[in-house]
């Protein structure tokens, strides 16, 4: 009997109620492999999810996130709110990065500017909420009489104070 079931292709299930005949998956269900005893319920993309690929008898639906949200999880199993560059998501919504930190994406968190002095370099371009600092040559590499256009980066990593 097991051998009969193994003959059932993807898109069908082995129906015990019908002498193990291969029956098509019912609407809104699928089987992606052969020999299945049941079909799986199709994923529904609703709420903050939108459909990227419709469910078929042999493959599950695939979801994306609606505008203003981004996917998390191996198969976009979650949607998280976007923020602007220079912000991060907190309990109080999207908040600007604290001084000394930046976020160049619509997702993720604010992280400290690179500390140029740790590599013996100077700050060539100051950091902003949206961009990291750009490190330049070390002060010793500068020609005599020349000086860095901007002060060196803070010696310690900046912390986050509650807003």
């Amino acid at each position: 009997l097991q051998d009969l079931c193994s003959n059932c292709p993807a898109g069908t299930f082995c129906d015990n109620n019908r002498s193990q005949i291969c029956s098509p998956c019912p609407p809104n269900s699928f089987s992606s492999a052969g020999g299945q005893r049941t079909c799986d319920i199709c994923r529904q993309c609703k709420g903050v999810f939108k459909t990227r690929k419709e469910c078929s008898s042999t493959s599950n639906a695939e979801c994306d996130c609606i505008s203003g949200y981004h996917c998390l999880g191996a198969e976009c199993s979650m949607c998280e709110q976007d923020c602007k560059q220079g912000q991060e998501l907190t309990k109080k919504g999207c908040k600007d990065c604290c001084f000394g930190t930046f976020n160049d994406q619509k997702r993720g968190i604010c992280r400290p500017w690179t500390n140029c002095s740790l590599d013996g370099k100077s700050v060539l371009v100051n950091g902003t909420k949206e961009r990291d600092v750009v490190c330049g040559p070390s002060p010793a590499d500068l020609s005599p009489g020349a000086s860095s256009a901007t002060p060196p980066a803070p010696a310690r990593e900046p912390g986050h104070s509650p807003q």
Epitope: M78, E80, T90, R107, G108, R111, P112, G159
Partner: antibody
Framework: QVQLQESGPGPVKPSETLSLTCAVS?????????WSWVRQPPGKGLEWIGE???????YYNPSLKSRVTISVDTSRNQFSLKLSSVTAADTAVYYC??????????WGQGTLVTVSS | SSELTQDPAVSVALGQTVRITCQGD??????ASWYQQKPGQAPVLVIY???NRPSGIPDRFSASDSGNTASLTITGAQAEDEADYYC???????????FGGGTKVTVLG
Amino acid sequence: QVQLQESGPGPVKPSETLSLTCAVSGGSISSSHWWSWVRQPPGKGLEWIGEIYHSGRTYYNPSLKSRVTISVDTSRNQFSLKLSSVTAADTAVYYCAREDGGIMDVWGQGTLVTVSS
Amino acid sequence: SSELTQDPAVSVALGQTVRITCQGDSLRRFYASWYQQKPGQAPVLVIYGKNNRPSGIPDRFSASDSGNTASLTITGAQAEDEADYYCSSRDRSGYRWVFGGGTKVTVLG
């Protein structure tokens, strides 16, 4: 579907360096995610070790910072952990994970590393 | 000591409700994430953000928070919910991660 797989040489002797690699499949390591290492000693809780971005930028757990190096190889779609001067206290299951805004949304199955002479 | 504090263990009768708490200064500003871990398996994310469940996580799992305390509630606990549960958030720096010590949930009956 993104999947992570840890691999390493197995047992490590005290004072030696532990080396592990995490292979990323079903997606690019150059996506806008960070890639973390987390460990769990037998019968104990989870401990975050550190993380890396595809640019090579890293952050480490301060308690391990002096011994940890995390690197990334975008051409092989993998990232690696090195932990130096290991002791028996470093015996643990080591997990790699994908991190997004503090959410570890995809995990490897973990690999047990035993430190023993 | 961990920057996120959890009770080590809690038990609940089958079908009843259990609440797990997680305390830490960073939780005043940022939400905790919650992970379920069964023996010999990798952790699985069950709650993130204010009270969001990944697809596939049953709606008996929910989260709430107040001040510096985050809570995970299992309403109508099932035998398969027996596991260790870890909260996670940022450490004091704001850009590194930390886990709570974990809470072992035992489902009785």
